[in-house]
């Protein structure tokens, strides 16, 4: 499977909400016998490889984040990370998934990357990722709501394999 | 779901020795995986941590002697030039520690013992 | 971070109620993360408290915790025998040198 980012930039005014999106491209798998993990963190665009660094979003690591279901369920991040920090993580049974970050400051522009990691029990795994950038402006040039801009088909598959 | 720490042995001083943990049951892309040490009769000491494809971090006196590596399923620590302050049962666990969901994400192993002795 | 634990030992009668004090050098990250770990001998430490006051499954109400920031404390309240045991606060300051440090311990004997 790929990860696909349909965005590649997010442009926000401040105190606005924003959700960043990626999604599976397939096959993907729906047996009984694949997990899928998915989650979310902020990068720096590395020289060597993108998304490799993985610092906290809104002082939640990938680790807090991370959201687990076999390949049938949808899965959300619990109501205590919407309320404390403003953040929703969530997955449907498309493959679609998406953070959701309310109240944009600018401390919240940079890089943001998706993983999602894929187990096949007794098997081993296969890890993909996706990266998109948030800008959030302020002042009289910001837009007056957020404005995406689509990634470039090359771009928007772009697989990173473990 | 489980994580044990195996390589655990009675060395000489000046000895490297790599320790082994092996986890399952979950995946190492996911979470913090950390080294945690108690010499015998003492406190706890962290070693370090690292998380899949990202830089290890160590504490100020374990720089340079101790590394921490990982594969798909195992994390290493490698330890230069033992002394016998080294001896203590060393740890593997999951996550950074002070895990915000520590119900589910903190695991740890039984500990295997090294001693360093001449 | 250095994080500095009051104090290292503490006898106390079955029944009462034990504090213990966990003093940071630098806030944890976010505030919050800092864990209570309970040690018995032979046995890994076994998660109390985590995120400063949320209790870990299992783990009975007698025990709490409190604090942010810099300061945090571990309550322990009608001390029963088998409370007797090492216990460790846990820090984390984020991803660097030092990013992570337990107290010293406090034992508890229980009378």
């Known amino acids: 499977f790929k990860v696909a980012t349909p965005y590649s930039l997010y442009v926000c005014p401040e105190g606005q909400n924003v959700t960043l999106t990626c999604r599976l491209l397939g096959p993907v798998d729906k047996g009984h016998d694949v997990t899928f993990y998915k989650t979310w963190y902020r990068s720096s665009r590395g020289e060597v490889q993108t998304c490799s660094e993985r610092r906290p979003i809104r002082n939640l690591t990938f680790q807090d984040l991370h959201l687990h279901h076999g390949g049938h369920q949808a899965a959300n991040t619990s109501h205590d990370l919407a309320q404390r920090h403003g953040l929703e993580s969530a997955s449907d049974h498309h493959g679609n998934f998406s953070i959701t970050m309310r109240n944009l400051t600018l401390l919240d522009s940079g890089l943001y990357c998706c993983l999602v990691v894929e187990i096949r029990h007794h098997h081993s795994e296969h890890r993909v990722h996706g990266a998109m950038e948030l800008q959030v402006q302020t002042g009289k040039d910001a837009p007056s709501n957020c404005v995406v801009y689509p990634s470039s088909s090359q771009d928007s598959e772009n697989i990173t394999a473990a | 779901q489980s994580v044990e720490e195996s390589g655990g042995r009675l060395v000489t001083p000046g000895t490297t020795l790599t320790l082994t943990c092996t986890v399952s049951?979950?995946?190492?892309?996911?979470?913090?995986m950390s080294w945690v040490r108690q010499a015998p009769g003492k406190g706890l000491e962290w070693i370090g941590m690292t998380y899949t494809g990202g830089s290890a971090y160590y504490a100020s006196w374990a720089k340079g002697r101790f590394t921490i590596s990982q594969t798909s399923t195992t994390v290493d620590l490698k330890m230069t030039t033992l002394t016998v302050a080294d001896t203590a049962t060393y740890f593997c666990v999951r996550g950074y520690l002070a895990d915000y969901y520590g119900d589910r994400d903190n695991l740890w192993g039984p500990g295997t013992l090294v001693t360093v002795s001449s | 971070i250095v994080m500095t634990q009051t104090p290292s030992s503490k006898s106390v009668p079955v029944g009462d109620t034990v504090t213990i004090n966990c003093q940071a050098s630098e806030s944890v990250f976010s505030d919050d993360r800092l864990a209570w770990y309970q040690q018995k001998p032979g046995q890994p430490p076994k998660l109390l408290i985590y995120r400063a006051s949320n209790l870990a499954s299992g783990v009975p109400s007698r025990f709490s915790g409190s604090g942010s920031g810099t300061q945090f404390t571990l309550t322990i309240n009608d001390v029963v025998c088998d409370d007797a045991a090492t216990y460790y606060c846990?820090?984390?300051?984020?991803?660097?040198?030092?990013?992570?440090?337990f107290g010293g311990g406090t034992e508890v004997v229980v009378k």
């Open positions: 846990a820090g984390y300051k984020g991803d660097s040198t030092d990013g992570v440090a």
């Open positions: 049951g979950f995946s190492l892309s996911l979470y913090y």
